[in-house]
Interface confidence: medium
């Protein structure tokens, strides 16, 4: 058999669609794997072939494009379902070929059921809104290409199960939903239902996304180191365990990388010979501000270790800060008998 460049099963593009709704699925070859588009391939004499493997089957079979009302069809590089059925779930393959060239990729398609409140196993995209930041909008996603611009669909927005009308700070504006001033109480799942006519039939597109209200850039500050601080002295005797937490607060910043690290005598802990371990934990507030804790631990501290400089560093897109821990050796209590003897001039 002739060789075909097989890109395998592209699980990164796990496609989920709702049952009994239209779905248009573009062949991923042109989007992610090949350097040319469908038009170029078509004009070069390449043909796009579709086939599929049903759920829990190994057998590849052709897609039936002769169903009543053209339920499944292909248009250029798009596979259309008008509408989907539950048993359309499976792995779909698009193959581009001619007599000398062949390339193919498979991808999973899952047809998902939803209840009357739009609950389903669908993985929901998350849209982040800044808290108390002025008007912000979300747009009904993934509806392009389903109907021509001459068709005017009706769009209904829901929060959870409830139709959005007369909400205090949330206003439906066609494909957009406007938040006049986003608050924590606006967190939740929002659904747009787009209804449009096609060839005497009415179709519905349901799109749900999660809105998460996050810290506003107006309130963002550079990292704040809570610990170590000037109020706490780590006073230890040689042989004791030294535990120093570095706890840092980071304001939420979109796409910011938050970093915390320790230096010991100006070096990273990995670069020095003492037996030090560092454990990290991360927690988030309701607005996704982040508190990172890195605990530096030396099981049996030596008097040399107690003379070193222990500095906690933190960095975000807002800036970099550092704070040294106050570490010192505990002064032993005076030994009474020796002092008494010395006081009497004993040798």
């Amino acid at each position: 058999s002739e060789r075909c460049d097989d890109w395998g099963l592209d699980t990164m593009r796990q496609i989920q669609v709702f049952e009994d709704e239209p779905a248009r699925i573009k062949c991923p070859l042109f989007e992610h794997f090949l350097k040319f588009n469908y038009s170029t391939a078509h004009s070069a004499g390449l043909t796009l072939i579709w086939y599929w493997t049903r759920q829990d089957r190994d057998l590849e079979e052709p897609i039936n494009f002769r169903l009543p009302e053209n339920r499944i069809s292909k248009e250029k590089d798009v596979l259309w379902f008008r509408p989907t059925l539950l048993n359309d779930t499976g792995n779909y393959t698009c193959m581009l070929r001619n007599t000398t060239y062949c390339s193919k990729v498979a991808f999973p398609l899952e047809v998902v059921q939803k209840d009357s409140c739009f609950n389903s196993p669908m993985k929901l995209p998350v849209h982040k809104l800044y808290i108390e930041y002025g008007i912000q909008r979300i747009t009904c996603p993934n509806v392009d290409g389903y109907f021509p611009s001459s068709v005017k669909p009706t769009i209904t927005w829901y929060m959870g199960c409830y139709k959005i009308q007369n909400f205090n700070n949330v206003i439906p504006e066609g494909m957009n939903l406007s938040f006049l001033i986003a608050l924590i109480s606006n967190n939740g799942n929002y659904t747009c239902v787009v209804t449009y006519p096609e060839n005497g039939r009415t179709f519905h597109l349901t799109r749900t996304l999660t809105v998460k209200v996050v810290g506003s850039p107006k309130n963002a500050v550079p990292p704040v180191i809570h610990s170590p601080n000037d109020h706490v002295v780590y006073e230890k005797e040689p042989g004791e365990e030294l535990l120093i937490p570095c706890t840092v607060y980071f304001s939420f910043l979109m796409d910011s990388r938050n970093e915390v690290w320790w230096t010991i005598d100006g070096k990273k802990p990995d670069d020095i010979t003492i037996d030090v371990t560092i454990n990290e934990s991360i927690s988030h507030s309701r607005t996704e501000d982040e508190t990172r804790t890195q605990i530096l631990s030396i099981k049996k501290v030596t008097s040399e270790d107690l003379k070193r400089s222990y500095v906690c560093h933190a960095r975000s897109a807002k800036g970099e800060v550092a704070k040294a821990a106050k570490v010192k050796q505990k002064v032993p209590a005076p030994r009474y008998t020796v002092e008494l003897a010395c006081g009497f001039g004993a040798t």
Partner: antibody, heavy 123, light 112 residues
Framework: QVQLVQSGAEVKKPGASVKVSCKAS????????MNWVRQAPGQGLEWMGQ????????YYAQKFQGRVTMTRDTSTSTVYMELSSLRSEDTAVYYC????????????????WGQGTLVTVSS | DIQLTQSPSSLSASVGDRATITCRAS??????????MHWYQQKPGKAPKLLIK???DLESGVPSRFSGSGSGTDFTLTISSVQPEDFATYYC??????????FGQGTKLEIK
């Protein structure tokens, strides 16, 4: 989930000492200050002091200086509050309470509380 | 030390009423961006429970009928529509500076 579990009720004679324990779970023990707050019968809340478990650093309210000692055992995630030279006015429910974090140094709210330990001082 | 004065010391309300408790600090407990004032609810025989922190930040799990406001020296706790489970004693608390914390003397919310 965060839990603070305190030791049981105590009855003490005037002049004696009492040591109340508070075992923490559900969070990184050494990174949060632990406070002690007491409440005499029918009265309001009174802050006694706090301890930072990582270092053992303590701060005490002026009123209790010299009579109160706060310690911790990091191996069992437990803090202790010992009050000496007890008098009848020390009869109260004693609470341990953890502080939360906030973005600025110095200001903390008491976000989790123990169930309280009743200490009765009576001859 | 900063003193906190709560008023009133007791308050009678009916279910559905709006209830307001104020707390005045002897000096400012605010800096740019936040106020170090917190509110707690305590029911008989129970430990206090944090309701509002940093003057206006509702603690997770606390009903939205509770709200806090104020800055500097004057702070307010408001219950927009009192429910049967809200009858309790309320305390304000400041954590300004280390290491001295103080509480207000408490306000008892009673059924009218």
């Amino acid at each position: 989930q965060v839990q603070l579990v305190q030791s049981g009720a105590e009855v003490k004679k005037p002049g004696a000492s009492v040591k109340v324990s508070c075992k923490a779970s559900g969070y990184i023990f050494i990174t949060y200050w632990m406070n002690w707050v007491r409440q005499a019968p029918g009265q309001g809340l009174e802050w006694m002091g706090q301890i930072f478990p990582a270092s053992g650093t303590t701060y005490y309210a002026q009123k209790f200086q010299g009579r109160v000692t706060m310690t911790r055992d990091t191996s069992t995630s437990t803090v202790y509050m010992e009050l000496s030279s007890l008098r009848s006015e020390d009869t109260a429910v004693y609470y341990c309470a953890r502080t939360d974090f906030y973005r600025y140094d110095g200001g903390y709210a008491l976000d989790y509380w123990g169930q309280g330990t009743l200490v009765t001082v009576s001859s | 030390d900063i003193q906190l004065t709560q008023s009133p010391s007791s308050l009678s309300a009916s279910v559905g009423d709006r209830a307001t408790i104020t707390c005045r600090a002897s000096q400012s407990v605010s800096t740019s961006g936040y106020s170090s004032m917190h509110w707690y609810q305590q029911k008989p025989g129970k430990a206090p429970k944090l309701l509002i922190k940093y003057a206006s930040d509702l603690e997770s799990g606390v009903p939205s009928r509770f709200s806090g406001s104020g800055s500097g020296t004057d702070f307010t706790l408001t219950i927009s529509s009192v429910q049967p489970e809200d009858f309790a004693t309320y305390y304000c608390h400041h954590s300004w500076g280390i290491p001295m914390y103080t509480f207000g003397q408490g306000t008892k919310l009673e059924i009218k």
